[in-house]
């Protein structure tokens, strides 16, 4: 049986489990989803500001289905994607297409996940198989992080969300199995 067999309202997402601070350094590397990949102009402050709290970050809402093997959530889950741009809070409204960009100068900042929330998701499986569950970590908020010149692209890998996590039926979690990451066939639904 194909996915047509399932109705959109067949399963509900179990309420989120709560929020967690920045996860341990074991996020899967391949879970980048389609966020701005550290792209665009390097976000820099036109005036010298040393306090990262003065910077703000773009938080984009992103929805995707959670999958595990052939099983898929009946409804997509929503989380935040932290865009690659950071800027002075007074210049960077939290919305796309508004506000002014500034010229690069000064330290490099990146917009990265700050807090995660854990959510248990029920999955429907084809062929009349019993439903399964998976715990997924979803980005709940973003923050600006100042990078030194020693940070390189490989060190930015853990800025990706876990959302695209591989397929373990897990509770959201930072995980150290990068290989599993490319497994989760995520379907992005905007």
């Amino acid at each position: 049986q194909g996915w047509q067999a399932f109705k959109n309202d067949a399963t509900e997402i179990i309420p989120e489990l709560g929020e967690y601070p920045e996860p341990p350094p074991e996020l899967e590397n391949n879970k980048t989803m389609n966020r701005a990949e550290n792209g665009g102009r390097p976000p820099h402050h036109p005036f010298e500001t040393k306090d990262v709290s003065e910077y703000s970050c773009r938080e984009l809402h992103f929805t995707r289905y959670v999958t595990d093997g052939p099983c898929r959530s009946a409804k997509p889950v929503t989380e935040l994607v932290c865009s690659g741009q950071c800027g002075p809070a007074r210049l960077l409204p939290n919305a796309i297409g508004r506000g002014k960009w500034w010229r690069p100068s000064g330290p490099d900042f990146r917009c990265i996940p700050d807090r995660y929330r854990a959510q248990r998701v029920q999955l429907l499986c084809p062929g009349g198989e019993a439903p399964r569950a998976r715990k997924v970590r979803l980005v709940a908020s973003c923050k600006c992080k100042r990078l030194t010149r020693f940070h390189n692209q490989s060190e930015l890998k853990d800025f990706g969300t876990e959302a695209a996590r591989p397929q373990k039926g897990r509770k959201p979690r930072p995980r150290a199995r990068s290989a599993k990451a490319n497994q989760a066939e995520l379907e992005n639904a905007y």
């Epitope: 967690y20 341990p24 595990d68 998976r134 715990k135 397929q167 509770k171 979690r173 150290a176």
Partner: antibody, heavy 120, light 107 residues
Framework: EVQLQQSGAELVRPGALVKLSCKAS????????IHWVKQRPEQGLEWIGR????????IYDPKFQGKAIITADTSSNTAYLQLSSLTSEDTAVYYC?????????????WGQGTTVTVSS | DIQMNQSPSSLSASLGDTITITCHAS??????LSWYQQKPGNIPKLLIY???NLHTGVPSRFSGSGSGTGFTLTISSLQPEDIATYYC?????????FGGGTKLELK
């Protein structure tokens, strides 16, 4: 770094009870299911059961029902396995492991194991 | 309960050989099949999950295949560090069950 640190070896008398611990670091146990697996000397792996630390829900292999009780304390990020009415058949290494899907199709990190020896 | 029958129970091979271990489930387990490696005196480690996906850090000489009830773990170009006991495990339904293990030794 993800780690599951298990309590030390236990030497116990037949009929006694023992409680093993499995302390997680590098991740929150509420984000996973925690499983316990038994391995008798020179034998294979036997699944005992699992807990969802978020709500305390447990599932056991019927063979271990009445023998094992799995609990978790999310405040200390620790899972526990209690074994009662111990006999020589319970002499084994007991492992905890984490898994993020249910039923657990893969356990990606394991504790170092706790050896339980039942002897009079 | 789903029974997992693993064969052979022991296997002798030479370095550089390609070896195959099979696991047969008593009923359809879809893709919910993992393989673990346990070296002597060590803990089990996840090698492969969902039939064919390599866990982080596992060398590409390990591969898994199969579907439904029949599954295979293949190690190509056997290395000294591959000497271990290998277990399959089904995650289709509770209770979870493991195969009896295949002890791999050097000839």
């Amino acid at each position: 770094e993800v780690q599951l640190q298990q309590s030390g070896a236990e030497l116990v008398r037949p009929g006694a009870l023992v409680k093993l611990s499995c302390k997680a670091s590098g991740f929150n146990i509420k984000d996973y299911y925690i499983h316990w697996v038994k391995q008798r000397p020179e034998q294979g792996l036997e699944w005992i059961g699992r807990i969802d630390p978020e709500n305390g829900n447990t599932i056991y292999d019927p063979k271990f029902q009445g023998k094992a009780i799995i609990t978790a304390d999310t405040s200390s990020n620790t899972a526990y396995l209690q074994l009662s009415s111990l006999t020589s058949e319970d002499t084994a290494v007991y492992y905890c492991a984490r898994c993020d899907n249910d039923p657990g199709s893969e356990m990606d990190y394991w504790g170092q194991g706790t050896t339980v020896t039942v002897s009079s | 309960d789903i029974q997992m029958n693993q064969s052979p129970s022991s296997l002798s091979a030479s370095l550089g050989d390609t070896i195959t271990i099979t696991c047969h489930a008593s009923q359809n387990i879809n893709v919910w099949l993992s393989w673990y490696q346990q070296k002597p005196g060590n803990i089990p480690k996840l090698l492969i999950y969902k039939v064919s996906n390599l866990h982080t850090g596992v060398p590409s000489r390990f591969s898994g295949s199969g579907s439904g009830t029949g599954f295979t773990l293949t190690i190509s170009s056997l290395q000294p560090e591959d000497i271990a006991t290998y277990y399959c495990q089904q995650g289709q339904s509770y209770p979870l069950t493991f195969g009896g293990g295949t002890k791999l030794e050097l000839k």
